[in-house]
Amino acid sequence: KIDACKRGDVTVKPSHVILLGSTVNITCSLKPRQGCFHYSRRNKLILYKFDRRINFHHGHSLNSQVTGLPLGTTLFVCKLACINSDEIQICGAEIFVGVAPEQPQNLSCIQKGEQGTVACTWERGRDTHLYTEYTLQLSGPKNLTWQKQCKDIYCDYLDFGINLTPESPESNFTAKVTAVNSLGSSSSLPSTFTFLDIVRPLPPWDIRIKFQKASVSRCTLYWRDEGLVLLNRLRYRPSNSRLWNMVNVTKAKGRHDLLDLKPFTEYEFQISSKLHLYKGSWSDWSESLRAQTPEEEPTGMLDVWYMKRHIDYSRQQISLFWKNLSVSEARGKILHYQVTLQELTGGKAMTQNITGHTSWTTVIPRTGNWAVAVSAANSKGSSLPTRINIMNLCEAGLLAPRQVSANSEGMDNILVTWQPPRKDPSAVQEYVVEWRELHPGGDTQVPLNWLRSRPYNVSALISENIKSYICYEIRVYALSGDQGGCSSILGNSKHKAPLSGPHINAITEEKGSILISWNSIPVQEQMGCLLHYRIYWKERDSNSQPQLCEIPYRVSQNSHPINSLQPRVTYVLWMTALTAAGESSHGNEREFCLQGKAN
């Protein structure tokens, strides 16, 4: 009943709880002298299903047969309507529609840890939509029985609150769960197990790692476990990896030596435990231990390259460049690089430690034979030095690679190809491809890039530090013993017509011809490698086509003579620049009149 029902009653037959698909009869009847004030024909009883009127009757009672009720709870309310008055609530009832419980499936029990309690889980099957009580029963040796009930609407877990002990690890226990509601009952199949089957150890704790003599090769992992643990699984991985290394160990007694860790690497370690070889289940993985392995001295050798620049008749500038070791080669934090410069005949040597840079520049005499050695040092030691004899890399003309070309290869890549030198190609020990941004001033501060190529290769794809619309000076060196030959070419990965033309800054007269001088186009406006300049001229106020002179682009050139102008005629001159993609717009216009004598 949903209220006091003083004025009447609502009865439900056969029951307030019905099976899905059943029909119920609902009767609403007024108690004596509870109808409308006037004679009873005017009593109008109305039956509501939630907020909807579903039936009515004039008189003292209303009978209604209801079908098709949905799963769950439906509220019916009976009201009385009298002429010219509000409806009065008489009484109401809730009807619960559901199904009998299905047989609980997959009953399984577990005890978490040796000191834990036995808890079981099962699958309820489809929702009954009714109050359903679950009873879990456990029977053991010596006729011992435990029982626990669950009145939660969605019950699929119960903890007995009892602890199984390892005194008789092979003793059998049997669990069964029974579901009961108003429409029926059903029991699971029994689940039989022993202590060893259901005890799931607690995950290991207090995990530590020790490196004997700060060496990665002598590493021991320690942990604590529950007393009966027989097996352990260890898994570990570098923190930046998704793949685990896995190790199974028996009777480890809380320690295990790891032999294959890499130096100077952060690892994540986890451990899991089990009581028996083939019974029971593994514990959850322990909390992760994160630890960095110690450094080891670097392996590998630095990739070193150099550049020579003539200063004057007695001095030359040497710029050394080297690449960082890979993480696996550095095996620690590189603290400094050691550069040793030695004059081979006189034995003079100087050593310098370089920090924070991967280049070094010095000035040495042009005479003598010079060699350098460069190594990388961390807290444990140094890499093997890379030794290079300083030579004139382009001196041997016969070693110069032939037919060097540079072509764009997709976004920000340049494919460099060449032919072996004319001199015995088998003499070549390796090729080095070097590239740097082209700066008209030949700026030595521009970063240098290089890669090494085996002697049988005749191409290399360069992609490191390559930007679109920038021209690169590319050199291919062929090295053989203490000799080298080189060839160079300009190349770009992407190009378009230059954004502006050269700016003419002066026109001077010399013996009947003129010399035009210009300022280079700013690098950011060249939009790739320049191929030609064009000088245009025409008589002022003339509508004729201009004449032009095309000059191949050379980095250092910024003037050119023209000797085909007529004296005492005023000309307008301008310049453009061309890349493989097209011609720039005009540079500035200059007027000039040649003063020389007429023929």
Partner: nanobody
């Protein structure tokens, strides 16, 4: 699924009579109270009459009381509305509906999908 099919409408002179029928299917007709509802051109739904699930009680809107009679035949799943002394203001499209979807209290338009096409009644001289 629930289906309701009305028939019997037509053109009639003021003062004349018509008998509307409704054939129900797709549900247990005898357990449901039923209603007649009408909709005049450009107007909302207006409840006209109802009969309870036993057929023993009937209700009428004030505007039709004494002129219209509702009845049902559970054996044939039929609902009827006998309309006498028709007036021009009775002109409308007439629908039958479950009482729970449209009663003298309110119409629940979310169930209107169950309704038939209705039958047109025109009262005119």
């Amino acid at each position: 699924q629930v289906q309701l099919q009305e028939s019997g409408g037509g053109l009639v002179q003021p003062g004349g009579s018509l008998r509307l029928s409704c054939k129900a299917s797709g549900f247990t007709f005898s357990t449901y109270a039923m209603s007649w509802v009408r909709q005049a051109p450009g107007k909302g739904l207006e409840w006209v009459s109802a009969v309870n699930s036993g057929g023993l009680s009937t209700d009428y809107a004030d505007s039709v009381e004494g002129r219209f009679t509702i009845s049902r035949d559970d054996a044939k799943n039929m609902l009827f509305l006998q309309m006498n002394s028709l007036k021009p203001e009775d002109t409308a499209r007439y629908y039958c509906a479950k009482y729970e979807d449209c009663s003298d209290y309110m119409c629940h338009r979310d169930r209107a999908g169950y309704w038939g096409q209705g039958t047109q009644v025109t009262v005119s001289s």
